[in-house]
């Protein structure tokens, strides 16, 4: 590229610093916070995105019943430790030496402990249930149109292989999107369902991670689909380990 083309950006991650100093003048981008190089042709891992976010200046039944082992991210934001591939480290600790184990989407799956806490492996989240409520519309969306549109969205915007979108359920005004991806199914280069779900969640909240002018503009047969509530449930390959005290609180 010529010097005139010195403005390069990362379409899939606005929380980056980029410059055309890669091989052949190709655009190279590094994530804020970690300084790790990211591949801008695909999604950035949730761990690196959370790290970048924490470093930024502060400012009837077709519906699925979440399993008893389903986790919801109640702890919110924290500054995570990521491994060299950008994945969450199994054990996370805060500045006061309080530690806990997380799953592959960074959600706590054990009680909090001290520095002696052991997290032997990063447990994979293999099933994600995204539960949405859309704003009132003149009539219900056509289920097959909605299904096709959401599958298209996850393929084209979030780069998620269609086989990982297991199902789309709809009972007006509730929409549920099921993502499934076992360790054995995920090939090199495949987007992780946890990363796709995180990008979708940020899009729905109007906090798009994508570069560009606007956020997500989702339409079904030309009719805008506006979401007013989102809940995400995470199911791990191994059930979480919480004490009975937490379960009865």
């Amino acid at each position: 590229h010529t010097a005139a083309q010195d403005n390069c950006t990362c379409p899939t991650n606005k929380m980056t610093v980029c410059s055309p100093d890669g091989p052949g003048g190709r655009c190279q981008c590094r994530a804020l916070g970690s300084g790790m190089a990211v591949d801008c042709s695909t999604l950035t891992s949730k761990c690196l995105l959370l790290k970048a976010r924490m470093s930024a200046p502060k400012n009837a039944r077709t519906l699925v019943r979440p399993s008893e082992h389903a986790l919801v991210d109640n702890d919110g934001l924290y500054d995570p430790d990521c491994d060299p591939e950008g994945r969450f480290k199994a054990r996370q600790c805060n500045q006061t030496s309080v530690c806990w184990c997380v799953n592959s989407v960074g959600v706590r799956r054990t009680d909090k402990g001290d520095l002696s806490l052991r997290c032997d492996e990063l447990v994979r989240t293999h099933h994600i249930l995204i539960d949405l409520r859309h704003r009132p519309t003149a009539g219900a969306f056509n289920h097959s149109d909605l299904d096709a549109e959401l599958r298209r969205l996850f393929r084209e915007r979030y780069r998620l292989h269609p086989k990982f979108v297991a199902a789309v359920h709809y009972e007006q005004p509730t929409i549920q999107i099921e993502l499934r991806q076992n360790t054995s199914q995920k090939a090199a280069g495949d987007v992780d369902i946890g990363d796709a779900a995180y990008y979708f969640e940020r899009d729905i909240k109007g906090e798009s991670l994508f570069q560009g002018r606007g956020g997500l503009d989702l339409r079904v047969r030309g009719e805008p689909l506006q979401v007013e509530r989102t809940l995400i449930y995470y199911l791990d390959e191994i059930p979480p380990k919480f004490s009975m005290k937490r379960l009865t609180a």
Epitope: Q5, T12, G25, S41, F210, G212, R213
Partner: nanobody
């Protein structure tokens, strides 16, 4: 500021060919999928074709399949649309635009593009 500049439009007879070019200035197209969108007189903008950031995936609207070919040269920061066997209904303003969508299996809709050129007029008439 992202600037996309189209060229290559003009007046051509039915059955003829044109090659449109889309060049980016002060901006590298690396990682962006690029598409061509056209607007016929009195009609809404319609996605014609797109090419993925790597160039490995291309998609076309049914109305132009087999006649139009999209390609890109990332070293030259340029995308091309080769239009053959042109018909009067291909007349319109052709825009090039960049999108964060992948172009892996679909042509993005007009509202899914982020950065637009000013357009170049294509007229197919005898």
């Amino acid at each position: 500021q992202v600037q996309l500049v189209e060229s290559g439009g003009g007046l051509v007879q039915p059955g003829g060919s044109l090659r449109l070019s889309c060049a980016a200035s002060r901006f590298t197209l690396d990682y962006y999928a690029i598409g061509w969108i056209r607007q016929a007189p009195g009609k809404e903008r319609e996605g014609v074709s797109c090419i993925s950031s790597s160039g490995g995936s291309t998609n076309y609207a049914d109305s132009v399949k087999g006649r139009f070919t999209i390609s890109r040269d990332n070293a030259k920061n340029t995308v091309y649309l080769q239009m053959n066997s042109l018909k009067p209904e291909d007349t319109g303003v052709y825009y090039c635009a960049a999108t964060t969508y992948a172009c892996s299996g679909y042509v993005p809709r007009a509202y899914e593009y982020d950065y637009w050129g000013q357009g170049t007029q294509v007229t197919v008439s005898s």
